[in-house]
């Protein structure tokens, strides 16, 4: 029947009978680094050029028999998923295949590096249109493989990779852990994360989004007209490579940062059953399933933002966590989160000419995460204003004093270790519009930006009764740029953004202690970009 | 996504006097050796030598040649399998792990990574 995966990635307005994929990725070349492929399969014949590149290790075992159909199985299927005539995502995309995996599906980091270099050389010798590189493979964490991916990405190439099939944190594998690569996890027809035997899809902060990856119909190397169903994060990555090819074909000037933000923006949100993931990974794992954009690829001028989590700081007393945006993105706010609630806040600082989001662990804490809100703001001029901690009992106020600059985020960082003596910081929209307000021993940081037509406002939501979390969402047309918690309890775990929702987390043990008068408030800064208007703070 | 994962990094700054060469005595290794945390995935004997970002094309070749020469003085044969110019400066080498200390002290070396397997997903 109609492949579930193609239906799933097709937005509802496309599902009408008249749907024909718009140009199907015809301006884009997709490089596939995988096994050998059966290039005369009806699905991909004339669409895939087999390059002369081959760098694979010997197959294991003395009695291993190279059976052509087995050698070609993985690569042929993926080529079909990307651009197959019948079951492909981007039916117009042309592909080039490089053999870096042997007949047993094994390759080496060095072979993959040489393959990536081959692509870079080809790009230098004969520059073509947009390039997508599909890496449906994974090994252990490799600094050099990640570095090579970074260099290729900075040369304008879009790299898409499998998150890995190890039911583990994707950050422990490469190239999945490379920040510049679009890392894809796998979901099934029921929007559940894919289980593969005793293992399954990888997860965590290094995954950018998920895509269909179970029972994916595609070209089989058993015969030139056969179809086979395969499962894995490779299949999921192939879907995203196809979607990327479609998007780049429609808008060839898209940068990697713009493409990633669009993939996130057009994804189906909050459809994955997160209970499958380990509890400590659920908050870090994006609840996003890739879909094609509606027929117009324009985002309607909407401000596009994503949330980037740092690695865990570790438990030492002075441990810090650092979250970074991509070079083209603006860091509009920084917050922090700690499962124990023992954190000393967050701030933005410049490292090597780039602003980064930092968070600091507190004495007795099990560690913190820094949470950056990274946005695409055309022609933005952003800066950080900070005020040292006020004397005990006094509030510290910071606002954006430059003309036409608006507040996009607030950060607070405490000098004192003792959590019991300080009242956590607050963000007040009613008394001081456009200001960050800190209390007792808090240094306050305001993120201030100027961009044509950028306007922002604060939205708050408080809960007095027992609650593990308080949320507030930005309304349609507005984008969440900043998220903070204004505590009513003695201990808050921090705040973070999930798509357009600001989530303020409260410590479990604090719930019983709370009196009805102490509301815990989630405070969101919501912004929008209206190019015709001038920058403004909305009351 | 940028911090190192579950990953082995070893400092192998061996005493520079060991080979008695004047130019080596002046260079103390600050480079690190890295390898896959999963032992079964490692490929000992093949190493990716990564040089500093600003290393020139000629210097890459000189560094590889220097490693071969110094290894030969110790009675080791080194095979340079590939030189990386276009994505990052470095080279791929087949050699005994005994030579890692020597390689880490070469000028321009940022780190050395042991080759490892990748798998179809």
């Amino acid at each position: 029947s109609i492949p579930w995966n193609l239906e799933r990635i097709t937005p509802p307005r496309y599902r009408a009978d008249e749907y024909q994929p718009p140009d199907g990725g015809s301006l884009v070349e997709v490089y596939l680094l995988d096994t050998s492929i059966q290039s005369d399969h009806r699905e991909i014949e004339g669409r895939v050029m087999v390059t002369d590149f081959e760098n694979v290790p010997e197959e294991d075992g003395t009695r291993f028999h190279r059976q052509a159909s087995k050698c070609d199985s993985h690569g042929t299927h993926l080529a079909g998923v990307v651009s197959g005539r019948d079951a492909g995502v981007a039916k117009g995309a042309s592909m080039r295949s490089l053999r870096v995996l042997n007949c047993q599906g094994k390759g080496t980091v060095s072979g993959t590096l040489i393959g990536l270099e081959f692509i870079r050389k080809s790009q230098l010798v004969q520059p073509v249109g947009p390039l997508v590189v599909l890496l449906p493979l994974a090994g252990g964490y490799s600094r050099v493989l990640n570095a090579a991916c970074q260099r290729l990405a900075r040369a304008g190439v879009v790299l898409v990779t499998a998150a890995g099939n190890f039911r583990d944190d994707a950050c422990l594998y490469s190239p999945a852990s490379a920040p510049e690569v679009i890392t894809v996890g796998a979901t099934n027809a029921q929007d559940q994360p894919v289980t593969l035997g005793t293992l399954g899809t990888n997860f965590g902060r290094c995954v950018d989004l998920f895509a269909p990856g179970e029972d994916i119909i595609g070209a089989s190397s058993d015969c030139s007209t056969c179809f086979v169903s395969q499962s894995g994060t490779s299949q999921a990555a192939a879907h995203v490579a196809g979607i990327a090819a479609m998007m780049l074909s429609a808008e060839p000037e898209l940068t990697l940062a713009e493409l990633r933000q669009r993939l996130i923006h057009f994804s189906a949100k909050d459809v994955i059953n997160m209970a499958w993931f380990p509890e400590d990974q659920q908050v870090l794992t994006p609840n996003l399933v890739a879909t094609l954009p509606p027929s117009t690829h324009e985002t309607g001028g909407q401000l596009l933002c994503r949330t980037v989590w740092s690695a865990h700081s570790g438990p030492t007393r002075t441990a810090t966590a650092t979250a970074r945006c991509a070079p083209e993105e603006e860091l509009l706010s920084c917050s922090s989160f700690s499962r124990s609630g023992r954190r000393r806040g967050d701030w933005i600082e410049a490292i090597g000419g780039q602003q980064v989001c930092k968070a600091l662990n507190a004495f007795g804490g099990e560690g913190v995460y820094a949470v950056a809100r990274c946005c695409l703001v055309p022609r933005a001029n952003c800066s950080i204003h900070n005020t040292p901690a006020a004397r005990a009992g006094l509030e510290t106020h910071v606002h954006c004093h430059q003309k036409d600059h608006v507040l996009t985020g607030c950060s607070f960082h405490w000098e004192v270790e003792d959590l019991s003596v300080r009242r956590q910081p607050a963000l007040r929209s009613r008394r001081q519009p456009g200001q960050c307000v800190g209390h007792q021993a808090a240094s306050v940081y305001a993120s201030c930006c100027h961009a044509p037509g950028l306007e922002c406002k604060i939205k708050e939501h408080g809960i007095s009764g027992p609650s593990e979390q308080v949320t507030v969402a930005c309304e349609a047309g507005w984008t969440l740029t900043g998220c903070n918690v204004l505590p009513g309890a003695s201990l808050t775990l921090g705040a973070y953004s999930v798509d357009n929702l600001c989530v303020a987390r409260v410590h479990d043990t604090a719930r019983a202690d709370r009196t009805s008068g102490e509301a815990t408030v989630a405070a969101a800064i919501c912004c929008r970009s209206r190019p015709s208007a001038k920058a403004s703070w909305v009351q | 996504q940028d911090e190192d994962g579950d990953y082995e990094e070893l400092m192998l700054a061996l005493p520079s006097q060991e080979d008695g060469l004047a130019d080596e005595a002046a260079h103390v290794a600050t480079a690190t050796f890295r390898r896959c945390s999963k032992e079964a995935w490692r490929l000992p004997g093949t190493y990716i030598v990564v040089l500093m970002e600003e290393t020139q094309r000629l210097q890459i070749e000189q560094t590889a040649h220097r490693l071969q020469t110094r290894a030969a003085r110790r009675g080791y044969v080194i095979k340079v399998l590939h030189i990386f110019y276009d994505l990052f400066p470095g080279f791929l080498v087949k050699m005994s792990s005994d030579l890692l200390g020597l390689a880490l002290k070469l000028p321009h070396v940022e780190y050395i990574e042991e080759d490892s397997f990748v798998f179809a997903q």
């Epitope: 029947s1 289980t195 179809f227 086979v228 169903s229 395969q230 | -």
Partner: antibody
Framework: EVQLVESGGGLVQPGGSLRLSCAAS????????MNWVRQAPGKGLDWVST????????NYADSVKGRFIISRDSSKHTLYLQMNSLRAEDTAVYYC???????????WGRGTLVTVSS | DIVMTQSPDSLAVSLGERATINCKSS????????????LGWYQQKPGQPPNLLIY???TRESGVPDRFSGSGSGTDFTLTISSLQAEDVAVYYC?????????FGQGTKLEIK
């Protein structure tokens, strides 16, 4: 040799249960969806159920929904149909059929007869 | 559910003559994304399981003689046997696999006149 062999049919009373098996050989079982199709004596073909290659997705005809369960064991290369609350109208030859993965059936077993009668 | 209706119910044709069987679906089985009609034809000889002849409405399964051909699109389809042979005596079924539940036509019995 590429083949499917059904077993487990027989005579059962209304309200009873039966479990059909289908042993697959000669192809990569895990990579193909599998189906059960039945044919009442002297009648046409009637699709009963399908299961995806991974076993993660199943579909049933309305007439058997809630009574029949399709499953597969990838290690044994075997497809199953657990039939509960059987009715006289379930009497048929039950065929196991390999899916091309598009929903058409490119390999069939020889069938096993299920008779529901008191 | 998509209802499949075949005509005629039975057909007698002389050896060497052309046999034509029609199949109509209650809704289109053409998938625009790949421009394929999700329709197959099966042959079932007495005492045997069905055998796939045609898929995608017009593509012959490997090993099927070229006297068998399929045509049509959307909702109307035809199976043609260009020159009837004795071994073609069987019941022929069309099937839509556009969506579950998969449905078959009621069958057409082909005999020799």
């Amino acid at each position: 040799e590429v083949q499917l062999v059904e077993s487990g049919g027989g005579l059962v009373q209304p309200g009873g249960s039966l479990r059909l098996s289908c042993a697959a050989s000669g192809f990569t079982f895990n990579n193909y969806a599998m189906n059960w199709v039945r044919q009442a004596p002297g009648k046409g073909l009637d699709w009963v159920s399908t299961i995806s290659g991974s076993g993660g997705t199943t579909n049933y005809a309305d007439s058997v929904k809630g009574r029949f369960i399709i499953s597969r064991d990838s290690s044994k290369h075997t497809l199953y149909l657990q039939m509960n609350s059987l009715r006289a109208e379930d009497t048929a030859v039950y065929y196991c059929a390999k899916d091309s993965n598009w929903g058409n059936f490119d390999l069939w077993g020889r069938g096993t007869l299920v008779t529901v009668s008191s | 559910d998509i209802v499949m209706t075949q005509s005629p119910d039975s057909l007698a044709v002389s050896l060497g003559e052309r046999a034509t069987i029609n199949c109509k679906s209650s809704q289109s089985v053409l998938y625009r994304s790949n421009n394929r009609n999700f329709l197959g034809w099966y042959q079932q000889k007495p005492g045997q399981p069905p055998n796939l002849l045609i898929y995608w409405a017009s593509t012959r399964e490997s090993g099927v003689p070229d006297r068998f051909s399929g045509s049509g699109s959307g909702t109307d389809f035809t199976l043609t046997i260009s020159s009837l042979q004795a071994e073609d005596v069987a019941v022929y079924y069309c099937q839509q696999y556009y969506t579950t539940p998969y449905t078959f036509g009621q069958g057409t019995k082909l005999e020799i006149k």
